[in-house]
C-alpha cells in the first residue's frame, strides 16, 4: 500500500490550543481568586489528598488503562493527560460561573479542583471510544463540549431534582458512556485493509494498561466518596466500593477465563471488569447498609462486565466502529444503569419502609434525572460527533488511525514511514 | 454537654469589617460541619453560610457572597465568620448552628441533615 | 435564590390543632430538602422540633408532627397550648449548596 503522510495538525494545533489557554488564563485572571480563609493546615492537607487520588486516577488510571493498542500506546497516555490539564482548567471556571458567579469572582477552593478534576474525568471515560481516530485539535473540542454539558447537566439536575454534589455528579458514568458512543457513531467507521493489525493489543502496552486498571481500583473508593458530605457517609462509601471492586476483581478473573473454551484469562475482560464493582456501586456506594450487599453487586457487575466483554465487542465493532478492546463505553453504559438501578431499589425500600405514600414520586424523580443525563449525553455527543467531523479539524487519514507515528517524533524510525 | 459560643459581635461602621468566632465543646468538632443564621431586629432567620466538617468545602447566601467568608480551625474547635464591606442591612444577631447528619433511611444508610444545635448569638450592630 | 413560603400568622385556640406549611416558590418539597422545622420564641435561640420531614426531635412532645402535604411540608400541632406560641420556622436544603429559611409563622395560640 503507498504511504499516506499524516495531516499534518501543525497549524491547526498549536494556534487552536494555544489560543485556547491564552483565553483561559485571561478568565482565570479577571475572574477568579484563591480562597484565602484556611485556618487549619491539617485540613487543608487531608482536603487535597482526596484531590491528589482522583488526579493519580485521571493521569495514571485512565491513561495507562486506555494504552493497550499495538502502536497508540504513546498517543494514549499523553492525550489524556493532555485532555485532563485542559478539562480540569475548564470545568473550575465552568462550575465556578455556574454555581457562584452572581458574587463578581469564582473562588477557587480545594473542593473546586476536585469537582473539576472529577469532570475531566468523564471526557478520559468517553475518549476510550474514540483514540487513535481522532488528532489532538478533535480532542480540545471533544473536551470543550463535554465538560460543558456535563457542568450543565449537573447545574440543571441540582436545581430541577434537588441533589447533592454526590448524586449529580454520579451521573458521570452513564453520562460519559453514551457520550463517547454517540461521538463513535459519528466518526468514520470502517479500518481500512492492512490496517487491523494497528488495533490489536500488545504485551508490553496491555502490561500498562494493567497498571491503569490497578491504579483505578486503588484509587475507585476515594472517586466514590470524594463528594460525600458527611464523615459517616464518605466511611460508608469507601467500604461498600473497596468490597465491590475486591469482588468484581475475583468475579473477572475467574468469569474471564469461564468464558474461553480453553479456560485462558482475557487480558481486554481483566482490564475493564476488575472496575466493574467500583462504576456499579457508585450511586449508591454510601446507601448500601452492609458488605454483603456490596460484594453481591461486584459479583454482578463483575459478571455483566465480563458477558458484555465477550458478547458486545462484536456489535460495537459493527455498529460504532469501536475496537474491541475499546470496552469501556458500553462497560460503562451497562454498569453505569446497573448502579442506577440499584439506588432506586433502594430508594422504594426506604420509601416503602417510612410508609408516607411517596414511592412513585421519588421513583419517577431519580428515573427522570437518569433519563436527563442519557439525553443531554447522547444530544451533545452526537454534536461533539459532527463538529469532530469538520474538515478543518484535518482529522488523520483512516489508514493512520490507531498510530503514534502520525503525531510522534520517533527519531529511530525512518523518516516518511 | 454541647455547646456552641459565639463571641466577636459589636458596634461597626458600614464598610469596615468584622471576624466572629464560634467556639465549639462537648463533642467533635471536626466532624460536623456548621452554618452561621443571622436575625435582623423583628425579622425572621436568614441563613447566612455553612462550611463542610473538614472545611473543604462552603457555601454562601446570595446576599453575603463575595464579602463574607466562613472558615474553621479544627485543632482550635473553632468556627469563623469574617464580614468585610460591612452593611447597614447586615444588623443582626449571628448565631452559630450544629449541622447533625441522621440516618433517614429505614433499609438503607441514607442520612439527612438539619441544625441540631445553636448558640446564643451575638449581635452585630453597623451603624454610621 | 429559591424562596421559601410559610404563612405569616396564624392563629389557633387552646387544645385545637392547626397546620402550617412550607412551600416553593417554584416547585414541590419532598423529602430530598430535609425539610426541618424550629421554634423560636422571642429573645432566645431556635429550638429543634422536627428534622427529616417528620422526626421528633429528643424532648419535643408528640403533639407536633411533621409531613408532606401535596406539595408542601407540614407542620401540625394537635392540642396546641398556651406555651406553644412562638414563631415557627421552616427550613429548605438546597441540593448542592445553601440552605433556605421561610419566612416564618408567628402563632397565636387565643
Known amino acids: 500500500m503507498s504511504s499516506k503522510y499524516p495531516r499534518s495538525v501543525r497549524r491547526c494545533l498549536p494556534l487552536w490550543a494555544l489560543t485556547l489557554e491564552a483565553a483561559l488564563i485571561l478568565l482565570f485572571y479577571f475572574f477568579t481568586h484563591y480562597d484565602a480563609s484556611l485556618e487549619d493546615q491539617k485540613g487543608l492537607v487531608a482536603s487535597y489528598q482526596v484531590g491528589q487520588d482522583l488526579t493519580v486516577m485521571a493521569a495514571i488510571g485512565l491513561g495507562f488503562l486506555t494504552s493497550s493498542f499495538r502502536r497508540h500506546s504513546w498517543s494514549s497516555v499523553a492525550f489524556n493527560l493532555f485532555m485532563l490539564a485542559l478539562g480540569v482548567q475548564w470545568a473550575i471556571l465552568l462550575d465556578g460561573f455556574l454555581s457562584q458567579f452572581p458574587s463578581g469572582k469564582v473562588v477557587i477552593t480545594l473542593f473546586s479542583i476536585r469537582l473539576a478534576t472529577m469532570s475531566a474525568l468523564s471526557v478520559l471515560i468517553s475518549v476510550d471510544a474514540v483514540l487513535g481516530k481522532v488528532n489532538l485539535a478533535q480532542l480540545v473540542v471533544m473536551v470543550l463540549v463535554e465538560v460543558t454539558a456535563l457542568g450543565n447537566l449537573r447545574m440543571v439536575i441540582s436545581n430541577i431534582f434537588n441533589t447533592d454534589y454526590h448524586m449529580n455528579m454520579m451521573h458521570i458514568y452513564v453520562f460519559a458512556a453514551y457520550f463517547g458512543l454517540s461521538v463513535a457513531w459519528c466518526l468514520p467507521k470502517p479500518l481500512p485493509e492492512g490496517t487491523e493489525d494497528k488495533d490489536q493489543t500488545a504485551t508490553i502496552p496491555s502490561l500498562s494498561a494493567m497498571l491503569g486498571a490497578l491504579f483505578l481500583w486503588m484509587f475507585w473508593p476515594s472517586f466514590n466518596s470524594a463528594l460525600l458530605r458527611s464523615p459517616i457517609e464518605r466511611k460508608n462509601a469507601v467500604f461498600n466500593t473497596y468490597y465491590a471492586v475486591a469482588v468484581s476483581v475475583v468475579t473477572a478473573i475467574s468469569g474471564s477465563s469461564l468464558a474461553h473454551p480453553q479456560g485462558k484469562i482475557s487480558k481486554t475482560y481483566v482490564h475493564s471488569a476488575v472496575l466493574a464493582g467500583g462504576v456499579a456501586v457508585g450511586t449508591s456506594c454510601h446507601l448500601i447498609p452492609s458488605p454483603w450487599l456490596a460484594m453481591v453487586l461486584g459479583l454482578v457487575a463483575g459478571l455483566i462486565s465480563v458477558g458484555g466483554a465477550k458478547y458486545l465487542p462484536g456489535c460495537c465493532n459493527r455498529v460504532l466502529g469501536i475496537p474491541h478492546s475499546s470496552i469501556m463505553g458500553y462497560n460503562f453504559s451497562l454498569l453505569g444503569l446497573l448502579g442506577e438501578i440499584i439506588y432506586i431499589v433502594l430508594l422504594v425500600l426506604d420509601t416503602v419502609g417510612a410508609g408516607n405514600g411517596m414511592i412513585g414520586f421519588q421513583v419517577l424523580l431519580s428515573i427522570g434525572e437518569l433519563s436527563l443525563a442519557i439525553v443531554i449525553a447522547l444530544m451533545s455527543g452526537l454534536l461533539t460527533g459532527l463538529l469532530l467531523n469538520l474538515k478543518i479539524w484535518k482529522a488523520p487519514h483512516e489508514a493512520k488511525y490507531f498510530d503514534d507515528q502520525v503525531f510522534w517524533k520517533f527519531p529511530h524510525l525512518a523518516v516518511g514511514f | 454537654q454541647v455547646q456552641l459560643v459565639e463571641s466577636g459581635g459589636g458596634v461597626v461602621q458600614p464598610g469596615r469589617s468584622l471576624r466572629l468566632s464560634c467556639a465549639a465543646s462537648g463533642f467533635t468538632f471536626s466532624s460536623y460541619g456548621m452554618h452561621w443564621v443571622r436575625q435582623a431586629p423583628g425579622k425572621g432567620l436568614e441563613w447566612v453560610a455553612v462550611i463542610w466538617y473538614d472545611g473543604s468545602n462552603k457555601y454562601y447566601a446570595d446576599s453575603v457572597k463575595g464579602r463574607f467568608t466562613i472558615s474553621r480551625d479544627n485543632s482550635k474547635n473553632t468556627l469563623y465568620l469574617q464580614m468585610n464591606s460591612l452593611r447597614a442591612e447586615d444588623t443582626a444577631v449571628y448565631y452559630c448552628a450544629r449541622e447533625f447528619y441522621t440516618r433517614s433511611g429505614l433499609w438503607s444508610q441514607g442520612y439527612s441533615y438539619y441544625m441540631d444545635v445553636w448558640g446564643k448569638g451575638t449581635t452585630v450592630t453597623v451603624s454610621s | 435564590q429559591t424562596v421559601v413560603t410559610q404563612e405569616p400568622s396564624f392563629s389557633v385556640s387552646p387544645g385545637g390543632t392547626v397546620t402550617l406549611t412550607c412551600g416553593l416558590s417554584s416547585g414541590s418539597v419532598s423529602a430530598r430538602y430535609y425539610p426541618s422545622w424550629y421554634q423560636q420564641t422571642p429573645g432566645q435561640p431556635p429550638r429543634t422540633l422536627i428534622h427529616?420531614?417528620?422526626t421528633r426531635s429528643s424532648g419535643v412532645p408528640d403533639r407536633f408532627s411533621g409531613s408532606i402535604l401535596g406539595n408542601k411540608a407540614a407542620l401540625t400541632i394537635t392540642g396546641a397550648q398556651a406555651d406553644d406560641e412562638s414563631d415557627y420556622y421552616c427550613?429548605?436544603?438546597?441540593?448542592?449548596?445553601?440552605?433556605?429559611f421561610g419566612g416564618g409563622t408567628k402563632l397565636t395560640v387565643l
Open positions: 427529616s420531614t417528620n
Open positions: 427550613v429548605l436544603y438546597m441540593g448542592s449548596g445553601p440552605w433556605v
